[in-house]
Interface confidence: low
């Protein structure tokens, strides 16, 4: 016996957030892993007084304590519908079924005399049917339904007389069923029997307040278990060759402060006072944990030396329950002021350390849903995924000897103090129906798949590829709005006077009269800010730099009456100096952010994008920029993420759609202007960039979620892409969905009707497709009332806690970008695509491993899209160059321009043009690499500042 559980709270220093196996492990369980599912008799059998069954303490408790529930009479009616339970088991494909025998169904008054024939027949039929199906029964003798007669006559488990009566009952079960049962559980979760049955009064028999009674009950339960184990070991094991244990339940707990020894001590006490209370005598040294003996000496019974010897080792494996009953409501004593946690992996590690690495059967695990949830129990899938992932990690990474897993529960049923207000079944049962059909929930489909695959196969992503992007691929970095410096920061050479420094006197500079020096014209390098930009860009080794102009700075009045020439000169410098380094610019004309619309003040006050005239003002601004910078800039983005302006114009759906309409018109007017007036001489390309996260159904077994995922893409991307890339009008699916909600009185939104002239104006006004892609969203359908864009979509998002995520909860799901690229091509044809922003926030200020991981994985998927799917991907712009103070850390550089290690990683990918085979040449011909920049530099020299 080792007893070293407290070591679990000393955190593993090797934990790395980007080793995804430490978050979610794609692997299989051991070959002979034991997959099962469980029920409790009282919860599902129903027929509480049918065919001679006696009342249990719970039948009585329900009538006396749970006023709004009259009985478990109906429940799922497993006693009547045995065949339906067997069909459900067949559907899932389990290796074992864990169920409990109702003591009062066999012996109505608890005393072992002649068994109730109908009860005996029921369990015998069930066992025969399981054996026939090759499903191993795991049978629990006592899952809380003590015969009422024993409670009334003896005071239940408070009286040690029950120990022998329980042993008689167990003996009978071994005799009658032992030929077909190889796994026995004596008692299910004795902690709850004692604590809630006699302490809080929340469970039958509903006694409360007497701490001595609580620990007496616990004592008798342990002794009863031990007696039965010895009985089985001596009289039945030799010929039945089975195993026997007791299911012990627990919560898990984390210290408030992971370094604080007092908090860690409290966590240990918390686990010991719940799990250790029963585990220590049985799996440990045969006695109660030392901490309990000291603290509870006045109420905790004492084991004699002989009893300790008798208790010790009375379990053939560690049966562990980890579910809501141990978490809600968790008494304050057990919490010890620390943080309750659902980390099953850590709980298993604690058991390993505390009880010398026993073989473990997870005898109950699962969570619950609200009773209104029927078959689409999406959150249950994610809870199961999380728990199973933790079990797999415990087996594969921590070498914990878990040999089986019991999903809880097979059926919806009576859930103790929660009665019928929650559901825990993998099969839905309508308790008010007569036939009590078992309808598989999403979680049943999911568990079935897990069992079939014996774990988690990595189906989502294909293996990494080796290969390279083309020589003309744009390797970029994106920056948001560059605020122009109003005056060159360095006045050097612009002042013609000579000065002498009075170093010994007043330490001032004195002008030397009569001397005039030669000055020189202003230079781009006079702007300190530009120097910083160029230094960062040079270190990035990118070929392209995407940044945004500040419309409000260039045209403070919103029209051409007052042009800020200094701002234009600043931007021209950024572009021209970049070109000298071989870095071309992709310039964004308008980059609104949530906090600041970035519009010139007069336009903002004239209702901004709700006013159609803003589109005309934008056209004039775009024309100015094309004219002033277009000789140097060959890639233009008119508007960044217009589909995200719904975050700002969100007073109503009609505001959102109206603003979006004006943004589309603004873009189209700018594109038409470029096409007509500037393209012939400048030969550039113009588009707008859309926020384009991918969407997956949160619940892949629910049709409504698949439809919601497609609807998300329609409302998010097609909303702008369809009018520009394809038809000149909004997506039919989006229009129809909003209209149908309108008809049903669920929304007063309506998409604007476009005139034929507007359709002609919009259609085809893109030279390439520009997408900002960051993550994949898991979406579910939820009918929402209200007249806002967000509610018009009828979509809710789900955060998958098993996924690697950033501090702002962006999930790292690389394969989403490949799916997005294929979807765009399928819907809008084979066009040039640029990923104009893609990145993740990472807390690290130096070694930003999450960003490196993200870049490597996402670029792999983009490469697959290029090599395998033949998508015309032309460029990837990592987001973003430098982080901003007190904003999520997306930058390759800190806000004070310190470089992070992801820069070298990106450098390497750029210099290799992807992920080449060993020894393959990554060089492109010199002419290909430099043609564009030679032309650019020639232009730079010809154009005056």
């Amino acid at each position: 016996f080792s007893g070293d559980g407290r070591a679990i709270w000393s955190k593993n220093p090797n934990f790395t957030p980007v080793n995804e196996s430490q978050l979610f492990l794609y692997d299989t369980f051991p070959k002979n892993f034991f997959w099962g599912i469980g029920t409790g008799a009282l919860q599902v059998e129903g027929s509480w007084k049918k065919d001679g069954k006696g009342p249990s303490i719970w039948d009585h408790f329900i009538h006396t304590h749970l006023k709004n529930v009259s009985s478990t009479n109906g429940s799922s009616d497993s006693y009547i519908f045995l065949e339906k339970d067997l069909s459900a088991l067949d559907f899932i494909g389990v290796s074992f079924y864990q169920f409990s025998i109702s003591w009062p169904r066999l012996f109505p008054d608890g005393i072992v005399t002649v068994a109730n024939a109908k009860g005996l027949q029921y369990y015998s039929t069930l066992l025969d049917a399981l054996v026939l199906r090759n499903i191993e029964p795991i049978v629990t003798l006592y899952h809380w339904d003590l015969p009422l007669a024993l409670q009334e006559k003896y005071g239940g488990w408070k009286n040690d007389t029950i120990i022998d009566i329980f042993n008689d009952y167990a003996t009978y079960c071994f005799q009658m069923f032992g030929d077909r049962v190889k796994y026995w559980i004596t008692i299910h979760n004795p902690y709850l029997v004692a604590w809630h049955g006699y302490g809080t009064g929340m469970h039958a028999p509903g006694e409360k307040g007497n701490l001595a009674a609580v620990y007496t009950v616990g004592h008798n339960l342990i002794k009863a278990h031990s007696k039965v184990w010895h009985n089985y070991n001596t009289h039945f094991r030799p010929h039945q060759k089975g195993w026997l244990s007791i299911t012990l339940g627990s919560h898990w707990i984390e210290p408030n402060r992971s370094e604080n020894t007092m908090d860690i001590f409290k966590c240990q006490q918390s686990m010991v006072s719940v799990l250790g209370w029963f585990a220590n005598p049985i799996h440990g040294d045969g006695d109660y944990p030392e901490g309990m003996r000291k603290k509870l000496f006045s109420v905790l019974p004492i084991f004699s030396e002989a009893e300790k010897h008798e208790m010790r080792g009375t379990a053939d494996f560690f049966a562990f329950s980890f579910g809501p009953n141990n978490f809600k409501p968790l008494n304050t004593m057990a919490k010890m002021g620390q943080n309750v946690s659902l980390n099953l992996r850590e709980a298993l590690n604690w058991i390993k350390l505390e009880y010398n690495n026993p073989r473990i059967l997870i005898a109950e695990n699962g969570w619950f849903t609200d009773s209104r949830v029927k078959t689409e129990d999406t959150t249950a899938i994610y809870m199961m995924k999380n728990f199973l992932s933790q079990v797999l990690q415990a087996i594969r990474l921590d070498e914990i000897r878990v040999f089986g897993y019991t999903a809880w529960s097979l059926l919806d049923g009576f859930e103790w103090q929660d009665a019928y207000t929650i559901r825990r079944g993998l099969f839905y049962v309508d308790f008010n129906s007569k036939q009590k059909e078992r309808k598989p929930k999403s979680s049943a489909h999911y568990y079935k798949q897990i069992i079939r695959e014996n774990g988690f196969s990595l189906k989502e992503s294909t293996p990494d590829v080796q290969g390279q992007f083309p020589c003309d691929f744009s390797w970029g970095v994106t920056e948001s709005v560059l605020k122009p410096e109003s005056v060159a920061s360095s006045p050097q050479f612009s002042d013609p006077h000579l000065y002498v420094w009075n170093a010994t006197g007043n330490r001032l500079l004195h002008r030397v009269e009569g001397v005039r020096l030669k000055t020189r014209p202003a230079q781009c390098t006079d702007f300190v800010n530009i120097k910083k930009q160029l230094e960062m860009l040079a270190r990035m080794k990118v070929t392209h730099y995407r940044f945004a102009l500040d419309w409000a700075s260039v045209l403070p009045t919103g029209n051409l009456s007052a042009v800020n020439r200094q701002a234009l000169r600043y931007y021209r410098c950024v572009v021209s100096e970049g070109l000298k380094l071989g870095i071309s610019a992709m310039v964004t004309l308008y980059y609104p952010t949530h906090a600041h619309l970035g519009l010139p003040e007069p336009l903002l006050h004239a209702d901004g994008w709700l006013n159609p005239s803003t589109a005309e003002a934008f056209q004039a601004y775009a024309g100015l920029c094309f004219q002033e910078l277009g000789d140097l800039v060959k890639l233009w983005i008119t508007i960044n993420e217009p589909n995200r302006l719904s975050d700002i114009y969100n007073r109503s759906g009609n505001d959102t759609y109206g603003a979006a309409h004006n943004l589309l018109v603004a873009h189209a007017l700018a594109w038409r202007l470029y096409d007509r007036q500037f393209r012939p001489s400048q030969r550039g390309a113009v588009s707008l960039s859309l926020h384009a996260d991918w969407a997956e159904p949160a619940n892949p077994y629910a049709d409504s979620h698949w439809r919601a995922a497609e609807r998300f893409l329609q409302f998010e991307i097609a909303w702008f892409a369809e009018p520009l890339f394809k038809t000149g009008d909004y997506p039919a699916a989006m229009r129809e969905y909003i209209a149908s909600k309108h008809r049903r009185g669920l929304s007063s939104s309506a998409l604007p009707r476009l005139t034929e002239a507007e359709r002609r104006l919009l259609k085809g006004t893109v030279d390439f497709c520009a997408l900002n892609h960051f993550t994949t969203r898991f979406v579910m359908h939820e009918q929402l009332a209200g007249s806002r864009y967000d509610s018009d979509r009828d979509i809710q998002f789900l955060q998958d806690i098993t996924r690697l995520s950033s501090p702002t909860r962006l999930a790292v799901i690389p394969w989403g970008v490949r799916k997005l690229l294929r979807w765009v091509r399928r819907n809008y044809g084979d066009m040039d695509i640029y990923i104009t922003a893609s990145g993740i926030d990472d807390q690290a200020l130096e070694d930003d491993r999450l960003r490196k991981y993200y870049l490597g994985k996402y670029l792999q998927e983009v490469l697959k899209a290029y090599l395998i799917d033949k998508v015309r991907i032309k460029g990837y712009y990592a987001f973003k160059l430098a982080e901003e103070k007190s904003k999520p850390r997306f930058g390759f550089f800190t806000s004070d321009f310190k470089a992070k290690s992801s820069i070298q990683f990106y450098n390497k990918v750029i210099s290799s043009r992807g992920f080449p085979f060993e020894n393959s040449s990554s060089r492109c011909s010199q002419t290909q690499e430099n043609t564009e920049c030679t032309v650019c530099l020639f232009l730079v020299q010809k154009k005056p500042l």
Partner: antibody, heavy 124, light 109 residues
Amino acid sequence: QVTLKESGPVLVKPTETLTLTCTVSGFSLNNARMGVSWIRQPPGKALEWLAHIFSNDEKSYSTSLKSRLTISKDTSKSQVVLIMTNMDPVDTATYYCARSVVTGGYYYDGMDVWGQGTTVTVSS
Amino acid sequence: SYVLTQPPSVSVAPGQTARITCGGNNIGSESVHWYQQKPGQAPVLVVYDDSDRPSGIPERFSGSNSGNTATLTISRVEAGDEADYYCQVWHGNSDHVVFGGGTKLTVLG
């Protein structure tokens, strides 16, 4: 406070159809544990159960009268309606609606609240 | 169909105990409910699920159920207890509500 109130015609002619309405208050017909039954009692005779509707809209009818009865509910109006076709003088009775509190299954703990009843006479 | 049989009448002196029976095939496996109906009034539930009393019903009313007979017992009978009493079950197999024929309790004197 839970109440049920029956309403309908006092007099119907033989072969006609009787429509009775039970308006409930103090509980919802959507409540998973509530059902409503119709019961009648001819003058001086015993109670006779006619039909029952569950919260999930399942229905159950007396075997002897099944072909003549239709029970339905309008949750938004908190009403349960019984339609009985082809009325006959032997159908003269006081008609009651009563709430049943359903337990875990479709069994229930009796009819805990009754309406005051409405008397229907069938005569030409 | 399932039939519940009650004696048409039971008489008892005030202060004595009245027992009203309700017979049915294996009625012990059903939940039995009892109603009291006074002239001109709607029935009132007095015992449900064999032996439980709704709030407001005196402790004098109790019930039992086993084998083929369920019994309503009224101890210390009062004049105000005079009424018709009906037993009722929800017969699970046929999925029907069944009432007994009713018993008229007469309080003598």
